[in-house]
């Protein structure tokens, strides 16, 4: 008789999850010489240990500490790019501008990007059928706690000018409930971070509005200013052209004519 299994509202663990994490770890450590010392089997064991046999609504940041320790990585603190609701463009950007880093350009972010996982209380099984949904089931689920933990650490490491890419096509350009709004903003360290610069990415070809005047951006400015960090905002009217100009800054079509 099959054992009764909790039905959650969210999708189950990504198929071939253990193999995917292990393969990503091997690939990342091969590409990044500074992480060659990492033992990927130990990384997988620590990752697994964070959620296997635990109730998937009762995961804590503490559960992920062994994984955090193994994945400790130094990125240039003044080259950090945060993003909210515009992951693809942020990743395209750091692929072009190789000295800047999103969270997913670090080992731990790379391992978990776009994956889902959860276990079951008191069994060593991975649940491939369903996992808790943040809204409908519980917030202390394995995936949400992981991203909260790594996002907090990433923000805490930032210094000087920190950049954030925001989606200007959304009704809330800055969303207090996003990972950026609820975790990263509050974990930037005022003694290290001088300025947060927002890049508001426009969606429409002919959209020349100043989205830096949007009420949600003003709300972000207020939160940041209260934390004694300066705030700056730029409209990226043409993200396609912007990427092209980042790739080739000498291109005359990027530059105003005298």
């Amino acid at each position: 008789v099959p054992r009764w299994r909790q039905q959650w509202s969210g999708p189950g663990t990504t198929k071939r999850f253990p193999e995917t994490v292990l393969a990503r770890c091997v690939k990342y450590t091969e590409i990044h010489p500074e992480m060659r010392h990492v033992d990927c089997q130990s990384v997988w064991d620590a990752f697994k240990g964070a959620f296997i046999s635990k109730h998937p609504c009762n995961i804590t940041e503490e559960d992920y500490q062994p994984l955090m320790k193994l994945g400790t990585q130094t990125v240039p603190c003044n080259k950090i790019l945060l993003w909210s609701r515009i992951k693809d463009l942020a990743h395209q950007f750091t692929q072009v501008q190789r000295d800047m880093f999103t969270l997913e350009d670090t080992l731990l972010g790379y391992l978990a990007d776009d994956l889902t996982w959860c276990g079951e209380f008191n069994t060593s099984k991975i649940n491939y059928q369903s996992c808790p949904d943040w809204r409908k089931d519980c917030s202390n689920n394995p995936v949400s706690v992981f991203w909260k933990t790594v996002s907090r650490r990433f923000a805490e490491a930032a210094c000087d000018v920190v950049h954030v890419m925001l989606n200007g096509s959304r009704s809330k350009i800055f969303d207090k409930n996003s990972t950026f709004g609820s975790v990263e903003v509050h974990n930037l360290q005022p003694e290290k971070v001088q300025t947060l610069e927002a890049w508001v990415i426009h969606g429409g070809r002919e959209d020349s509005r100043d989205l830096c005047q949007d009420p949600t951006i003003k709300e972000l400015e207020s939160i940041i200013s209260k934390r004694n960090i300066q705030f700056s905002c730029k409209n990226i009217y043409r993200p396609d052209k912007f990427l092209q100009c980042v790739k080739n800054p000498e291109d005359s079509s990027c530059t105003s004519e005298i």
Epitope: Q97, T195, E197, C233, N235, I236, Y237, K241, F242
Partner: nanobody, 118 residues
Framework: QVQLVESGGGLVQAGGSLRLSCVAS????????MGWYRQAPGKQRELVAT???????NYADSVKGRFTISRDNAQNTVYLQMNNLKPEDTAIYYC????????????WGQGTQVTVSS
């Protein structure tokens, strides 16, 4: 807005020299073509000199042969050496990215006042 801090302006007699400096913090300034702009009273802001991240320069006809733009990428600093100054050079001088405003919007610093007396 502290990401662009211009300095070096002042009062100088016609024929004199000044060297303006601009410290620019933030990614867009570090890789983009940078420009020195000026705005005289009652006139529109105009671009007078540009320098690409690779060091290629361009000048407005009115300043050619008198002004020299340079940059120190390691220090995120852009300079404008102004020689043989004329009264018509009197303006507030600003530095900023010279990328087209149809691509990226500009946020301005407070500029530095240059006054040339005859």
């Amino acid at each position: 807005q502290v990401q662009l801090v211009e300095s070096g302006g002042g009062l100088v007699q016609a024929g004199g020299s000044l060297r303006l400096s601009c410290v620019a913090s933030g990614f867009i300034y570090s890789i983009s073509t940078m420009g020195w702009y000026r705005q005289a009273p009652g006139k529109q802001r105009e671009l007078v000199a540009t320098i690409t991240s690779g060091g290629n320069t361009n000048y407005a006809d009115s300043v050619k042969g008198r002004f020299t733009i340079s940059r120190d990428n390691a220090q995120n600093t852009v300079y404008l050496q102004m020689n043989n100054l004329k009264p018509e050079d009197t303006a507030i001088y600003y530095c900023n990215t010279a990328w087209r405003e149809t691509i990226v919007s500009r946020v301005w610093g407070q500029g530095t006042q240059v006054t040339v007396s005859s």
